[in-house]
Interface confidence: medium
């Protein structure tokens, strides 16, 4: 008998090279094989459970950056007046959540912020839990 | 043929709002659906393997905090003279281990330490390994 | 019907007690049960996907340490002029990658660097993806 295969784990890596002041970051998924989707610069959560979250980037100017998942809830990450980020965390997310950025710069110029090495990874840690598509 | 489902992954999120000097932190599991159990302010390990461990909290006063898993072994985390923690780590735990806090304050007052946003998450990383219940 | 068992997750914990200047660290796997292999002081990657990577150690002298996975690619970790490391990260690795250290010391003496508590853990996060052995 063939041993059972794992169904694909919900995971995604998105890249961002540009953020807009008082808005968010323009995220793109470099691979078509991702098991999670991007919509309106947000990562769509279909499965309940813990997620491993990795966030990296170097910014062209000082900014404050938050990563949100649900209106009215605190951010997953919140960094104040930084020029780079290299953080890892764990959070419980659920069906219908959307993971998105909010960015504020402190310069008088309201230009885009360039990002080098900008990467956000989400990996579901509870396969077998509730999912809805 | 229906593809196999994942059996539930061993994981738990516990909260703590109070720690006792020279003792530990009072931990509670907010969800009844957790796949791991709390007993005597310890998280019980049933399955051998690597665990992803996330620890967060803001303390009402400066303290030294350690997270242990086995008598006679070094701590999983050890923080000296801090008022907050936001750490993530990986450790190999085994059946019969118990994850628990030890706390020491540096004040002469032996009051309980209040904790804001106190959260400890454990997620098993090696499903398919040995478990005993 | 018996619920399906998980095939073993690709994971490994290696230890290192010694690093050689302008070379790497001598890594050994303390367990024979690891699902990943060490070859020529490198950890061999057989499965595509995200990996959780934990790196710890205390060094006998100041050094610069990088953890590589593929020629011509940037490092997974890069630490400059440190005497200890306690880092965690996530990276996408693929079949044929090899995870290995590069170390440089700043002393005129070309002695080996001793390492206390040197530990590198890799845990595959995408079971069900492509593997080749």
């Amino acid at each position: 008998q063939v041993p059972p295969q794992y169904p694909p784990i919900q995971s995604i890596r998105v890249q961002f090279t540009r953020c807009e002041n008082e808005k968010g970051c323009i995220i793109t998924s470099p691979s078509k094989d991702e098991t999670m989707k991007v919509q309106d610069n947000s990562i769509i959560i279909n499965c309940d459970g813990f997620y491993l979250i990795s966030l990296k980037g170097y910014f062209s100017e000082e900014l404050s950056l938050s990563l949100y998942y649900r209106k009215g809830r605190g951010p997953l990450f919140s960094l104040s007046k930084v020029t780079s980020v290299d953080s890892i965390g764990v959070a419980y997310l659920a069906f219908k959540d959307k993971v998105y950025f909010n960015v504020t710069t402190h310069s008088t110029s309201y230009k885009d912020i360039q990002v080098n090495g900008g990467e956000l990874i989400l990996i579901h840690q509870n396969p077998g839990g509730f999912c809805a598509y | 043929q229906v593809p196999p489902q994942y059996p539930p992954i061993q994981s738990i999120r516990v909260q703590f709002t109070r720690c006792e000097n020279e003792k530990g932190c009072i931990i509670t599991s907010p969800s009844k659906d957790e796949t791991m159990k709390v007993q005597d302010n310890s998280i019980i390990i049933n399955c051998d393997g690597f665990y992803l461990i996330s620890l967060k909290g803001y303390f009402s006063e400066e303290l030294s905090l350690s997270l242990y898993y086995r008598k006679g072994r070094g701590p999983l985390f050890s923080l000296s003279k801090v008022t907050s923690v936001d750490s993530i780590g990986v450790a190999y735990l085994a059946f019969k281990d118990k994850v628990y806090f030890n706390v020491t304050t540096h004040s002469t007052s032996y009051k309980d330490i209040q904790v804001n946003g106190g959260e400890l998450i454990l997620i098993h990383q090696n499903p398919g390994g040995f478990c005993a219940y | 019907q018996v619920p399906p068992q998980y095939p073993p997750i690709q994971s490994i914990r290696v230890q290192f007690t010694r690093c050689e200047n302008e070379k790497g660290c001598i890594i050994t796997s303390p367990s024979k049960d690891e699902t990943m292999k060490v070859q020529d002081n490198s950890i061999i990657i057989n499965c595509d996907g995200f990996y959780l990577i934990s790196l710890k150690g205390y060094f006998s002298e100041e050094l610069s340490l990088s953890l590589y996975y593929r020629k011509g690619r940037g490092p997974l970790f890069s630490l400059s002029k440190v005497t200890s490391v306690d880092s965690i990260g996530v990276a996408y690795l693929a079949f044929k990658d090899k995870v290995y250290f590069n170390v440089t010391t700043h002393s005129t003496s070309y002695k080996d660097i001793q390492v206390n508590g040197g530990e590198l853990i890799l845990i595959h996060q995408n079971p069900g993806g492509f593997c080749a052995y």
Partner: antibody
Framework: EVQLVESGGDLVRPGGSLRLSCVAS????????MSWVRQAPGKGLQWVAF????????TFADVVRGRFTISRDYAKNALYLQMNSLRAEDTAVYYC???????????WGQGTLVTVSS | SFVLTQLPSVSVTLRQTARITCGGD??????VYWYQQRLGQAPVLIIY???NRPTGIPERFSGASSGNTATLTISGALAEDEADYYC??????????FGGGTHLTVL
């Protein structure tokens, strides 16, 4: 005093390889993003490659992508440009430049000349 | 990719105002940087993020940017200002783009 000193420039045949080095002093190398910028004889500046302070992010001009790699050695305070499959049009003075905010090239070296000719 | 257009040369009478322009599609939405390169020397950053001067750069140098044009202004040009001037931006793919350069002659 901040100093960037390039070396490794030489005469090389088309299709050949060369490795340029840039040694930094007078500032905290770890905190600075680094670039290579070139200038063909009698021509303007052309950016070539960038590596961020942590070494994890690199970008390249389209004309050198796949042929050139950029790397850094924190122990030696050194930046490198490995140039393969060289062409006549790669002939230029190559400058290394650094910036604490990576959009500025705050400091520049004096350059090293690379000549690609048969 | 993003193209920056500069006039090859500009002349100015000693102690008069020189203006060097840099054209590019909606360049006003990007941060613009200016470099001075004297003959036989390495470039020097003189303006960053449109209109900011690094420490040590004289006040006579200023910058502005809007629409499709960025401008470097030298108020009261001196003989030592004779040099090549390059504008630079980063495009949305994080590639640095330089203009072709403008040679300033001080008469």
């Amino acid at each position: 005093e901040v100093q960037l000193v390039e070396s490794g420039g030489d005469l090389v045949r088309p299709g050949g390889s060369l490795r340029l080095s840039c040694v930094a002093s007078g500032f905290t190398f770890n905190n600075y993003h680094m670039s290579w910028v070139r200038q063909a004889p009698g021509k303007g500046l052309q950016w070539v490659a960038f590596i961020n302070s942590g070494g994890s992010g690199t970008t390249f001009a389209d004309v050198v992508r796949g042929r050139f790699t950029i790397s850094r050695d924190y122990a030696k305070n050194a930046l490198y440009l490995q140039m393969n499959s060289l062409r006549a049009e790669d002939t230029a003075v190559y400058y290394c430049a650094s910036g604490s905010i990576w959009t500025h090239f705050d400091y520049w070296g004096q350059g090293t000349l690379v000549t690609v000719s048969s | 990719s993003f193209v920056l257009t500069q006039l090859p040369s500009v002349s100015v009478t000693l102690r008069q105002t020189a203006r060097i322009t840099c054209g590019g599609d909606i360049i006003g939405s990007k941060n613009v940087y200016w470099y001075q390169q004297r003959l036989g020397q390495a470039p020097v950053l003189i303006i960053y993020r449109d209109n900011n001067r690094p420490t040590g750069i004289p006040e006579r140098f200023s910058g502005a940017s809007s629409g499709n044009t960025a401008t470097l202004t030298i108020s009261g040009a001196l003989a030592e200002d004779e040099a090549d001037y390059y504008c630079q931006v980063w495009d949305n793919s994080n590639k640095a783009m330089f203009g072709g350069g403008t040679h300033l002659t001080v008469l």
